[in-house]
Amino acid sequence: EAHKSEIAHRYNDLGEQHFKGLVLIAFSQYLQKCSYDEHAKLVQEVTDFAKTCVADESAANCDKSLHTLFGDKLCAIPNLRENYGELADCCTKQEPERNECFLQHKDDNPSLPPFERPEAEAMCTSFKENPTTFMGHYLHEVARRHPYFYAPELLYYAEQYNEILTQCCAEADKESCLTPKLDGVKEKALVSSVRQRMKCSSMQKFGERAFKAWAVARLSQTFPNADFAEITKLATDLTKVNKECCHGDLLECADDRAELAKYMCENQATISSKLQTCCDKPLLKKAHCLSEVEHDTMPADLPAIAADFVEDQEVCKNYAEAKDVFLGTFLYEYSRRHPDYSVSLLLRLAKKYEATLEKCCAEANPPACYGTVLAEFQPLVEEPKNLVKTNCDLYEKLGEYGFQNAILVRYTQKAPQVSTPTLVEAARNLGRVGTKCCTLPEDQRLPCVEDYLSAILNRVCLLHEKTPVSEHVTKCCSGSLVERRPCFSALTVDETYVPKEFKAETFTFHSDICTLPEKEKQIKKQTALAELVKHKPKATAEQLKTVMDDFAQFLDTCCKAADKDTCFSTEGPNLVTRCKDALA
């Protein structure tokens, strides 16, 4: 229904706390360089204005769209051009072009320092002094670094953060209580960020139809007892929610997500038997829980997929009558039978089926042509299954750090032109798939591995788009989203690459490395490894292992030495010489 004042409507629906949080996230995602205080001031002004509209919907400007109101606020910021350059040009446009312009200027890799966590005592002091401001800082810092973070989900993580701090700040040993818990939230939030970015990429590059197909597959796997009409309704609603969040319409997105959660909980009987636990929770926890609810038990009496989609004489007729509906029912039926497949694989199979019908239905004898389509799925299914087996075996043999290094070598050989920090970040993220997925039961591995890898590779593509340097990467990134992972997996050593000349300073280290946290040490070593591969792209695994073992031994020795500086300055050049010889 239409409301006289959109801002009053959203304020009433969401309540002040969530309203303020979402407005803060929106501003932080649009203007990523502004300080917390600058944004907090804008949020307060918007909230005060919303309250006047709640009191009187006919008050001046209350009838304006949210984009107009928010855009006007952003454009009134002093020094906009000095701080944001051409983003200021957006302010010369009218809605909806102005909002589109803001969206195009979102930076997936802003030049902001890493979000450092203060030490426990300091955190607890500032949390106790002003919990609201503390959580505001959290929302601001995460949102500006992750401009497509799913806003209602970020509110959920802030709530988790709040609960952890409330609990741990009352403990004697705050540090050991906080660290593992906050690390867990951080890890989950980072995964949530790359997954959501993938959804927004799907929406931006391929439109709502592509996202809806993803949603149909995912929902059909989770709710195999729901009928096609129910799955279509949920997919349509979920598409709307994600479109709004990806488009910066965060208040509408959060409101509609709450509505969707309410609908699911009111219609459990026709959706799934597994929803009750989620539905008993408060709003943010409920919506989060529903988004990762376990799969319902598959119906026992499902007929073979071939009956309706291969053996039926009406296949081409049904396809002609309503292509999207027919393909949608195929995707639904196939997905509900295969919770053990990744969504990417299911979409590849649906695409293959569509291409087969396009070709076969134009023939004089279509059934003879499409009769073998299910058999033709086999190689498409085997490829990711082999990928999972090979990589999980390697992970089990090497552990996470060793597995990351193996991936780093592999990807540096595939795309040596890509910057070393990007390669290291990608390899570290790709390598985490082992810890995340390889420990799961067999039937959960494939969906976990492939859908996670696809999300990480989407980030690689986004970063590469900014400064394209590798034809290999451009080729894989310009295809469809579901073909990206197989494309990257199939890449081999880039034969066109001219190796980097050996620079001793790249492999020169100082005693300050000894005091770095373990993660930072690993990144330094992985940076050196990527540089080695760029110098010798065809170095064997044995050669690289020899060099890296020598390097690790050198660090261990010098970091234990009484005079670390002398050790580094004398042993360092020897290490460089040995490395050159080993790779000669």
Partner: nanobody
């Protein structure tokens, strides 16, 4: 909405000819193979002939081979069946269908071959 409308049927004497037409709408006609099927009084459906989307490939039931010719005009989204040397056993309601479908969704056109 997919629509198929057959026309051109009628009463003819054995040995004579008839040309059936099927006007199609509501789908990408050139992307689909089309068929003619028929149902004689008191009998089941029988496949007669099929043609590919481009019109380059055709198939015929043995009972009509050499006498019937299937063709199509993609610009007019129309399917044809030229029937020569008609026999009494060709008497039936003729339907056009999409792809290899044997169950018609249209009214059909009645062809009666009788002296």
């Amino acid at each position: 909405e997919v629509q198929l409308v057959e026309s051109g049927g009628g009463l003819v004497q054995p040995g004579n000819s008839l040309r059936l037409s099927c006007a199609a709408s509501g789908f990408t006609f050139s992307s689909f193979g089309m068929s003619w099927v028929r149902q004689a009084p008191g009998k089941g459906l029988e496949w007669v002939s099929s043609i590919s989307g481009s019109g380059s490939d055709t198939l015929y039931a043995d009972s009509v081979k050499g006498r019937f010719t299937i063709s199509r005009d993609n610009a007019k989204t129309t399917l044809y069946l030229q029937m020569n040397s008609l026999r009494p056993e060709d008497t039936a309601v003729y339907y056009c269908t999409i792809g290899g479908s044997l169950s018609p969704s249209s009214q059909g056109t009645l062809v009666t071959v009788s002296s």
